[in-house]
Interface confidence: low
């Protein structure tokens, strides 16, 4: 069998809401994956499990089941949403995310995703991890790849 390629494209959108009394931030983060089937037979994307970490703490998990079938030599783009909660010991972030004196409230999140595919009874898991910027101060729609976090200081333009 040839490979099944999973490419994490990035954050598609992040929708934010707040609970002022609990000092809690709710972020619904929609991510995009490209899954390419390099085989001459169809494969089934059985499930996608995802989790989001902030500062080494898991703040959200999601699981999608029986997602799609990808035909021979075909590629499908799949969106999945992870509801996240920044609260409790991270409630100090509430002040940062709601601060109106700055325009962009970017936080760095680690996106982890595992895709399980099956073909002819055989199961295969492919995992990816990626750091991404997400604005926790407003609802944001991203151009694909725009939210990528590179651990390199970029020179100012």
């Amino acid at each position: 069998p040839r490979s099944i390629d999973v490419k994490y494209i990035g954050v598609k959108s992040a929708y934010v809401s707040y609970d002022v009394q609990k000092r809690t931030i709710y972020l619904n983060i929609t991510n995009t994956l490209n899954i390419t089937n390099n085989n001459y037979y169809s494969v089934e994307v059985e499930n996608i499990t995802a989790q989001v970490q902030f500062s080494k703490t898991v703040i959200g998990k999601a699981r999608l089941n029986n997602i799609t079938i990808i035909g021979p030599l075909d590629m499908k783009q799949i969106d999945y949403t992870v509801p996240t909660v920044i609260a409790e010991e991270m409630s100090y972030m509430y002040d940062f995310c709601t601060l109106i004196s700055i325009k962009v409230h970017n936080i760095v999140l680690m996106m982890q995703v595992t895709v399980t595919t099956t073909y002819f009874g055989h199961s295969e898991q492919i995992s990816q991890e990626r750091y991404q910027y997400v604005d926790c101060g407003r609802n944001t729609t991203y151009q694909l790849g725009q939210s990528e976090y590179l651990n390199v200081l970029q020179p100012q333009q």
Partner: antibody, heavy 118, light 112 residues
Framework: QVQLQQPGAELVKPGASVKLSCKAS????????MHWVKQRPGQGLEWIGN????????HYNQEFKDKATLTVDRSSNTAYMQLSSLTSEDSAVYYC???????????WGQGTAVTVSS | DIVMTQAAPSVPVTPGESVSISCRSS???????????LYWFLQRPGQSPQLLIY???NLASGVPDRFSGSGSGTVFTLRISRVETEDVGIYYC?????????FGSGTKLEIK
Amino acid sequence: QVQLQQPGAELVKPGASVKLSCKASGYTFTTFWMHWVKQRPGQGLEWIGNIDPSDSETHYNQEFKDKATLTVDRSSNTAYMQLSSLTSEDSAVYYCARSSNWDNFDYWGQGTAVTVSS
Amino acid sequence: DIVMTQAAPSVPVTPGESVSISCRSSQSLLHVNGHTYLYWFLQRPGQSPQLLIYRMSNLASGVPDRFSGSGSGTVFTLRISRVETEDVGIYYCMQHLQYPFTFGSGTKLEIK
């Protein structure tokens, strides 16, 4: 339309307990906090505490921590406040009021007048 | 706890005139998100309190625009222009920044 229905009055004996109800209608019960406020005759307003009906998280004014217990029944869209070990100091009108996360106390119940007397 | 002070127990006013009711907090009610968590309520005789102003200067739904709120982080004013007889009652300020929420002692609006 939004309504918070409270019984008009409760007469209770000293040392006893009473459970006050506040039945919500006209909105999604679990998306608004419910607050309880005390008003003694001829006096001002005192915030007792609040409860989030979605997960029963509560916050209490320390002055009422040992006096009041807040609960909800999601199946009947009703919030409750139990007052224990009642004395004459607890004779007052008790209001329930709802609030969203951002806007506060936009609807109030009519209040329940609690009289503690033997 | 944050202490809310309404220094004037009562204010007399003639119908048609304007009146200001003041309130002071023991610490700033300005949150880093830019909102000031100060509320004004009116309690008419024999009735439940009614929300007038939320977050210091926002008019609550259904409240006449004769009512307005202003202030800084610790000093607040409720202004009623063209007072009507139905405005009679006790006006309370309340802070909603920190638990426990606390009310001022109230200012009674009386018609001369």
